[in-house]
């Protein structure tokens, strides 16, 4: 019999956590697990519980996490890694749309995230989408071109800036930008 199947690991309500705000990491395996082990990678920290409640997010808790479980003497495969990001570590960038936030269906628009600091990484989030568009770009600026806009592109966008040297410490989100597709 092969290795035990991997558990799932999720962050609730989100893996993007403002400093000082709460978050819960939850490891979920099959029923009847003997022992869970939740660990922070690139560190030696772990706990033998399926749930880690963080009442106030700190910089030192940002990073990659994974979990496993044990039944008898057998360990499961590890879960997929979870990236826990602390936001609000740096001042917010500004997000703008070129040529403007109102665009005709079929047209082109570029969302641009700008910061005064020397960050080399930017992430763009559309409200309701689970994952960001990450774009390693030139220092001080990141462009996210949207070619051939459709109605599905309309919505509220925010961007974050951060450094590749500390990839789990992000800025506060930009003010929201409403993209209107006509």
């Amino acid at each position: 019999s092969g290795p035990l199947p991997k558990p799932s690991l999720q962050a609730l309500p989100s893996s993007l956590v403002p400093l000082e705000k709460p978050v819960t990491l939850r490891c979920q395996g099959p029923p009847g697990v003997d022992l869970y082990r939740l660990e922070k990678l690139s560190s030696s920290r772990y706990q033998d519980q399926a749930v880690l409640f963080i009442p106030a997010m700190k910089r030192s808790l940002a990073g990659r996490y994974r979990c496993s479980y044990q039944n008898g003497s057998l360990w499961s495969l590890p879960s997929d890694q979870l990236e826990l990001v602390a936001t609000g570590v740096f001042a917010k960038p500004s997000l703008s749309a070129q040529p403007g936030p109102a665009v005709s269906s079929g047209g082109d628009v570029t969302l641009q995230c700008q910061t005064r600091y020397g960050f080399d990484q930017f992430a763009l989030y559309k409200e309701g989408d689970p994952a960001p568009y990450k774009n390693p770009e030139r220092w001080y600026r990141a462009s996210f071109p949207i070619i051939t806009v459709t109605a599905a592109h309309s919505g509220t966008y925010r961007c974050y800036s951060f450094s590749s040297r500390d990839p789990y410490l992000w800025s506060a989100p930009s003010d929201p930008l409403e993209l209107v597709v006509t």
Epitope: S43, S44, R45, Q47
Partner: nanobody, 129 residues
Framework: QVQLQESGGGLVQAGDSLRLSCAAS????????MGWFRQAPGKEREFVAA????????YYADSVKGRFTISRDNAKNTVYLQMNSLKPEDTAVYYC??????????????????????WGQGTQVTVSS
Amino acid sequence: QVQLQESGGGLVQAGDSLRLSCAASGRTFSSYVMGWFRQAPGKEREFVAAISWSGGSTYYADSVKGRFTISRDNAKNTVYLQMNSLKPEDTAVYYCAAADPPSFYSDYDWPRDHEYDYWGQGTQVTVSS
């Protein structure tokens, strides 16, 4: 509680390799952070390397980074230190040690040197030029 016994030390030439082993007795081996330390004659004991419970994370002193590799086999209750490109300044007694990990609410990711609770007797490594 865990008992530790090092082996694999010896006399080698500069540039050679050596692999140290540390056998642990005790059923909770996989609960511990395992580390290697060394003490050269007339010097303080210094940290060399550490490895997390699963082996998924490692941490090295700058002086050995890129030359030494720490690993562990939880099924065999053993931790290893592979030492390559040895230098005369690596000459020391090498100790294996075990520690509980810091909690998630600590501000540090690895046990501090004084937090290693269990120690082996040491094995001598001599590197001649």
